[in-house]
Each structure stands twice: as structure tokens, then as C-alpha cells.
Amino acid sequence: ARNGDHCPLGPGRCCRLHTVRASLEDLGWADWVLSPREVQVTMCIGACPSQFRAANMHAQIKTSLHRLKPDTVPAPCCVPASYNPMVLIQKTDTGVSLQTYDDLLAKDCHCI
Amino acid sequence: ARNGDHCPLGPGRCCRLHTVRASLEDLGWADWVLSPREVQVTMCIGACPSQFRAANMHAQIKTSLHRLKPDTVPAPCCVPASYNPMVLIQKTDTGVSLQTYDDLLAKDCHCI
């Protein structure tokens, strides 16, 4: 159950999808990936205020307990709810291969 | 792919399962749950240093980019990898019912 999508902290401050451009060197992939030479990494960044995009019952509990015991229980965290697949052209022992990764690019975000 | 389980920050400091005792009042459930009157909430708490329990490729990317751009990209976050089901005895309009929740108690943790 996705809870409220209204961000009380102001536009763009809450958990949402961001794109970060990264080179193979940035990612530490230069020694095993040939292409793409640059990746538009989509990731989930932002705050998770009370019930904002709560992923499930556990997230709702976490929000309640964080309010009560902020030093013990952290606030929910903005993480991928789903992913977009991406193909990499990889170096192999014998040459090159295509490999599809299903867990590389965030598609959608929620708080948990 | 779960990466290293060794915590470089010291015993118990990294992402792991914790148990937090909470009453129905703490959880805001007193008006709709009859039992249990207290819940041993298992949740994922702790730091996610480089490659510690990295859930997937996305988590590994996040670690790399956090190292490069700590003000832009947050470190991976400690969240449930799976859940244990829990049954609640709920109040209903006509009386009481048993309801099983599959996403309430964390069973296992990883960093993402």
C-alpha cells in the first residue's frame, strides 16, 4: 500500500527517483565493462517523512516507532520499489558477452 | 549477491536484525487490534559500510557513487530482505477476525 505522495518538506525534497551520470571509472567497472561508457544511474534519494510512500505495514510501524524512539529506530529509508533492466557489454576471459542486469537501475521508489 | 558480512565498524554496528518491543498504543493500533497487546517488532537497523550485505548491483553502485559524491548520493540503507508473517486479532464491525500480515516483521536484512 503506497501512502501519501504529498511531500510536506517541499517540492522534490522527499523520496523520489533521481538520475546520476556516472562513468565506468566512477562505478569501478572499467576493468570488466566495455559499454556503455557512461551510465545514467537512476536511484532513490530523499526524505521519508511520516507515511510518505510507505511501502508496507513494516514501514508504517517504523514511522511510528521512530517518532517515539528517534535515537533507537531510524526513519524509513528511500529505496527502489522496482527496477528497470539494463544490458552491459562485458569483458570475459575469452572476449565479450552481453549480460542483462535486472537490479541495476531503480524504476520506482518507496519508503521502508 | 550478498556481499561481506564482516562489519568493519565493530560488533553490532552494521546492518542487522534488531527487536524493539512496542505496545499497541506505541504503534497506533489500539483502536483496531485486540491481540497481541505487545509486539516484538523485528526491524533492520545499522550502518551500511562499503559492500556490507549489498543486496544487489544497485547497492554496489550506490556505494561507489556515495564515496564519490557523498553530498548527492546517500549511502545504502539497511532494510528488510524478507519478512516473517504475523497474525493479528482485529476488531471488526461485527466482532473479531484473524488477519495474517506478510510484511510486518523483518526476517533478514540487507543494504540497498
Epitope: 559499454s35 528497470n84 544490458v87 557489454i89 565479450v96 541495476l104 | -
Partner: antibody, heavy 118, light 107 residues
Framework: QVTLKESGPGIVQPSQPFRLTCTFS??????????ITWIRQPSGKGLEWLAT???????RYNPSLKSRLTVSKDTSNNQAFLNIITVETADTAIYYC??????????WGQGTLVTVSA | DIVMTQSQKFMSTSVGDRVSVTCKAS??????VAWYQQKSGQSPKALIY???YRNSGVPDRFTGSGSGTDFTLTISNVESEDLAEYFC?????????FGGGTKLEIK
Amino acid sequence: QVTLKESGPGIVQPSQPFRLTCTFSGFSLSTSGIGITWIRQPSGKGLEWLATIWWDDDNRYNPSLKSRLTVSKDTSNNQAFLNIITVETADTAIYYCVQSAWDWFAYWGQGTLVTVSA
Amino acid sequence: DIVMTQSQKFMSTSVGDRVSVTCKASQNVGTNVAWYQQKSGQSPKALIYSASYRNSGVPDRFTGSGSGTDFTLTISNVESEDLAEYFCQQYNSHPVTFGGGTKLEIK
């Protein structure tokens, strides 16, 4: 297993349009880095890149042919399309649809012959 | 557009020999070159990517080399099944372009 198959009209009259269909399997056109490229080869000649339609609809065309080409896709049915308007006899060729993985033409269809003739 | 020149349209070789197919780019393309093999009546098949990396399933007698403007596809210990036309292609800049092809004949 990746497979691609082209289908089209076979014979087209000069100045008429035609449409080729590429039906593929073994991969998804919604995967980042994946595209469908159209390449043609006149009889006994070399290869000419025509256009690529990418997963994110960032379509690319050969500048020398751009005004006559359009590409499109139906991701859910695993199909891609090439439209050429006002064909000329010089458009007679075998047309290949190819799986592009980033900048690599990884897998090729068997090709379909298009003959432009009155 | 970058022109890829395969100066030898035909090359003749014998089974067991070593043969080198060359390709020259009209400007620097780094290592952004691929090679394709096309047997008679068939569609091209990807052999080499990034100048020197063999596609999976390609026998190790096929070797790619070169960078900048000069590229070579070498077939060591030629087999009769290598009778085909070989195309180079640059993908360093848009539009991608192919060489005119080199037909390998087996004596």
C-alpha cells in the same frame, strides 16, 4: 535465445511508401541499452546503417536518409517498424533488423529482400 | 561521415594459413570498431567488438587488433568454413559506418 525476423511487401513501386516489420524474441525493447537497428545491403554491395530505435524512444537516423525514414516500436508485442516514403530504385536491397546492444550490432535477422520496380 | 576503407576487396588464402584483413578509418575512432562475418546467402554475424574482443562462440583463431585509424582482423589457421566476406564498422561517431567488405577465398 535471441531471434529476429523481418517481414515486408517484397516488391514496391517507385515513389510509393513501404513498411517493414521486425518481430523479435529472446530480449525486451524495454531494457536499457537495447535497440532495434535497420541496416540494408544492396545486392553484391556493402552494409548501410539506416536507423535505430532505442528502448527510451531516442530514435537515430542516417542523416542522408532522415527525411524519408521513420522508425517505431510496439514493445509489448516485441515488434519494431521501419517506414520509407517515396522509394527509389536505389532502395532495392536486403533489409536487416538487428538487435543493438548499446553500440554493438549483436544479433541479426535473416533479412528480407525489397525490390523497387514498376 | 567517417569512411572505413577495406582496400582489399578479395583475398586468397589456403586452409591452415594465416591471413590478415585490414581496415582504415578516415579519422581517429579509438578502439570503437567491430568486425562482422557474412557467409554467402546469410546475414552478418558479430565477430569482434571494441577492436579486439571476441564475441562469445567465436573461435579463438579470430583476433582483432588496432586503434586510432588502423585495424586488423587476423584469422590464424584458416579453415574452409571461414570462406566469407568480412566487414569492419566504426561506432565512434554518428552515423556508424561500415567498410566495403573483404571477400576471403580459399584456394
